[in-house]
């Protein structure tokens, strides 16, 4: 499911519960995705020892994965709500091609990979409603994404395993950083 249990507007199981605010819904959605990533990481970590490797050992890769930096305004120092929100949405849009790549990378967690992908789409929609400056958000070029996907899928098995691990780790870190920032807003 792309939305955590109890989040669907049609859910009437708890009629006395206060409806979630926009911020609470976003918070819960991120936590839901992080739980999904955790499940996917369990499968990849069981298959290889990459999870124990230091970041430096895995740093030499050609992936251009979104990453939070001081200039993005999401850290405690230099915090800027609007700049940060634009970075979060832009970063999530950039991650979408990598989440598409993950779709055929899991045996026992195939549904979980799909749930992470769909939940991220929903999260982007939630965040776009919250953002005031949508013009500042750049959408990745579909043609560039298509050729990147082809290139990633053409890698040998070891590189594909490495790519899977790096995507999951980077996406986890990006979401955790986003959550910390959103909780300050």
């Amino acid at each position: 499911a792309p939305v955590p249990p109890g989040e669907d507007s049609k859910d009437v199981a708890a009629p006395h519960r206060q409806p979630l605010t926009s911020s609470e819904r976003i918070d819960k959605q991120i936590r839901y995705i992080l739980d999904g990533i955790s499940a996917l990481r369990k499968e990849t970590c069981n298959k290889s020892n990459m999870c124990e490797s230091s970041k430096e050992a895995l740093a030499e890769n050609n992936l251009n994965l979104p990453k939070m930096a001081e200039k993005d305004g999401c850290f405690q120092s230099g915090f800027n709500e609007e700049t940060c929100l634009v970075k979060i949405i832009t970063g999530l849009l950039e991650f979408e091609v990598y989440l598409e790549y993950l779709q055929n990378r899991f045996e026992s967690s195939e549904e979980q990979a799909r749930a992470v992908q769909m939940s991220t789409k929903v999260l982007i929609q939630f965040l776009q409603k919250k953002a005031k400056n949508l013009d500042a958000i750049t959408t990745p070029d579909p043609t560039t994404n298509a050729s990147l996907l082809t290139k990633l899928q053409a890698q040998n098995q070891w590189l594909q395993d490495m790519t899977t691990h790096l995507i999951l780790r980077s996406f986890k870190e990006f979401l955790q950083s986003s959550l910390r920032a959103l909780r300050q807003m």
């Epitope: 992080l34 490797s53 230091s54 970041k55 870190e173 950083s177 959550l179 910390r180 909780r183 300050q184």
Partner: antibody, heavy 120, light 110 residues
């Protein structure tokens, strides 16, 4: 053995500076969030600050501007730079590791602590 | 800024007693709360995280409950090695806070 070992504590004069170290062994520090917590004699635990996997940091309001957390991944060591020290900074300083697998901060591995005394 | 208030600050109990310590957050922190045990001259030890999940190697006589703003640590049958100071800690947000920990509860022998 998986452990954290703090060092660098000692006697320092008010207004002085000190750099504490936290050396990790048995695991790669760069894969984890690491925090500093202090405890004044006979008092409770006081959170100082944290460094996340991306070198993002956060500090307690009272520590901003005086304390800085950094790390050297090649040495597998974390640092706490403390400037403009005051008598009330006298405490045992602990570093602690968060496994960073989740979104909430929780500290499941602690060092033995190093004592910092600020006095003239 | 989130503040953590722990009560009582100290209590006296006997071996075999059921002990309850409470912790209150100044705003909702979901279930993002941990409990630690500290003995004199030693580093704190994680007992419970996510409000109710027992950390590895912690005896089942320790349990945690709560969500939102109100949390409880319970020791079902106090053992001699349980006399120590207990702290709660919020892990929800470490920004714009003075302290992530509660003030502590010292459990003493009656």
């Amino acid at each position: 053995e998986v452990q954290l070992v703090e060092s660098g504590g000692g006697l320092v004069q008010p207004g002085g500076s000190l750099r504490l170290s936290c050396a990790a062994s048995g695991f790669s520090l760069s894969n984890y969030y690491v925090t500093w917590v202090r405890q004044a004699p006979g008092k409770g635990l006081e959170w100082v600050g944290i460094i996340y996997g991306s070198d993002e940091t956060a500090y307690a309001t009272w520590a901003i501007g005086r304390f800085t957390i950094s790390r050297d991944n090649s040495k597998n060591t974390l640092y706490l730079q403390m400037n403009s020290l005051r008598a009330e900074d006298t405490a045992v300083y602990y570093c602690a590791r968060d496994d960073s697998s989740d979104w909430d901060a929780k500290f499941n591995l602690w060092g033995q602590g190093t004592l910092v005394t600020v006095s003239s | 800024a989130i503040q953590m208030t722990q009560s009582p600050s100290s209590l006296s109990a006997s071996v075999g007693d059921r002990v309850t310590i409470t912790c209150q957050a100044s705003q909702s922190i979901n279930n993002e709360l941990s409990w630690y045990q500290q003995k004199p001259g030693k580093a704190p030890k994680l007992l419970i995280y996510r409000a109710s999940t027992l950390a590895s190697g912690v005896p089942s006589r320790f349990s945690g409950s709560g969500s939102g703003t109100d949390f409880t640590l319970t020791i079902s049958s106090l053992q001699p090695e349980d006399f120590a100071t207990y702290y709660c800690q919020q892990g929800y947000s470490l920004r714009n806070i003075d302290n992530a920990f509660g003030g502590g509860t010292k459990v003493e022998i009656k």
